[in-house]
């Protein structure tokens, strides 16, 4: 029984490689999947000496290890690319690294949108 999952319909979208892949650089992505399959949001990034380099954000297909995650939290110690996924609209806006070995928790907030 999949009880009480947050339905994911839209995610924050970002692609650092947007020019090469001929996509938008950022925005919102409406998630589309097969009937009866769950959808998630994800974020991926690199951390070069404390400098965060966002790689991609968007929708993520049904993945059991993403079920019931309300927040986007990466736990791998020191990967080449950090990854997290979550359930709920725009849940990938913020993302966190909380290493399993008990290092410091680091949360990455999106930059505030400039006033128009």
């Amino acid at each position: 029984s999949g009880r009480g999952e947050a339905e994911t319909r839209e995610c924050i979208y970002y692609n650092a490689n947007w020019e090469l892949e001929r996509t938008n650089q950022s925005g919102l992505e409406r998630c589309e999947g097969e009937q009866d399959k769950r959808l998630h949001c994800y974020a991926s990034w690199r951390n070069s000496s404390g400098t965060i380099e966002l790689v991609k954000k968007g929708c993520w297909l049904d993945d059991f290890n993403c079920y019931d995650r309300q927040e986007c939290v990466a736990t791998e110690e020191n990967p080449q690319v950090y990854f997290c996924c979550c359930e709920g609209n725009f849940c990938n806006e913020r993302f966190t690294h909380l290493p399993e070995a008990g290092g410091p928790e680091v949360t990455y907030e999106p930059p505030p949108t400039a006033p128009t």
Epitope: S1, G2, R3, G4, E5, E34, D36, K37, R38, L61, D62, D63, F64, N65, C66, Y67, D68, R69, V73, T75, F83, C85, E100
Partner: antibody, heavy 118, light 110 residues
Framework: EVQLLESGGGLVQPGGSLRLSCAAS????????MSWVRQAPGKGLEWVSG????????FYTDSVKGRFTVSRDNSRNTLYLQMNSLRAEDTAVYYC???????????WGQGTLVTVSS | QTVVTQEPSFSVSPGGTVTLTCGFN?????????PSWYQQTPGQAPRTLIY???TRSSGVPDRFSGSILGNKAALTITGAQADDESDYYC??????????FGGGTKLTVL
């Protein structure tokens, strides 16, 4: 080092019950989904059940629905499988497995043997 | 009911190449099913070889590779060795918390 250690198997009569446990160490248990997979003697692997990181979502193969219940205690780093109304066809080695992103089983326990026989 | 099919048995000569396949009765296997492959020797727990179609698990030799061939997932072993003689299982994640294992392939190296 990731370790998964199953226990609780044994000989039980048809209609009886058993509770299997899987003690996890070497990783942060609460951060990963878990699953049970079984293997009848001389047969192939069969997925039995899965449970999400919080325990809020549980799933079963059709043949055990209504008889088996999967649960987890994240404070004790332990996964459970409560097996009721056992049948001869449930005789198998039961493995617990850690689930990682892209829904694969990245670590396996050594298994515990459940024998259902009168 | 979904049935995942594998060749029941396969033989390969030492140093040869073999491709095991994994299909199912409800259509084509694609990357969205996150195909994964496991090796098992008698009396042992399964060992993870390939996940997410084509990613080798840590410590797995590069003679093992995964792919999609036509409408099936495939595991290719190049330069087969005697200790590759094992049972090989594919698994498809069907979504909604459900996995289905193939029946397994018994690989003989002779």
């Amino acid at each position: 080092e990731v370790q998964l250690l199953e226990s609780g198997g044994g000989l039980v009569q048809p209609g009886g019950s058993l509770r299997l446990s899987c003690a996890a160490s070497g990783f942060t248990f609460r951060n990963d989904a878990m699953s049970w997979v079984r293997q009848a003697p001389g047969k192939g692997l069969e997925w039995v059940s899965g449970i999400s990181v919080t325990g809020g979502s549980t799933f079963y193969t059709d043949s055990v629905k209504g008889r088996f219940t999967v649960s987890r205690d994240n404070s004790r780093n332990t996964l459970y499988l409560q097996m009721n109304s056992l049948r001869a066809e449930d005789t198998a080695v039961y493995y617990c497995a850690k689930v990682y992103y892209t829904s694969f089983f990245d670590y396996w326990g050594q298994g515990t043997l459940v024998t259902v026989s009168s | 009911q979904t049935v995942v099919t594998q060749e029941p048995s396969f033989s390969v000569s030492p140093g040869g190449t073999v491709t095991l396949t994994c299909g199912f009765n409800s259509g084509s296997v694609s990357t969205s099913y996150y195909p994964s492959w496991y090796q098992q020797t008698p009396g042992q727990a399964p060992r993870t070889l390939i996940y997410n179609t084509n990613t080798r698990s840590s410590g797995v030799p590069d003679r093992f590779s995964g792919s999609i061939l036509g409408n099936k997932a495939a595991l290719t072993i190049t330069g087969a060795q005697a200790d590759d003689e094992s049972d090989y299982y594919c698994v498809l994640y069907m979504g909604s918390g459900i996995w289905v294992f193939g029946g397994g392939t018994k690989l003989t190296v002779l």
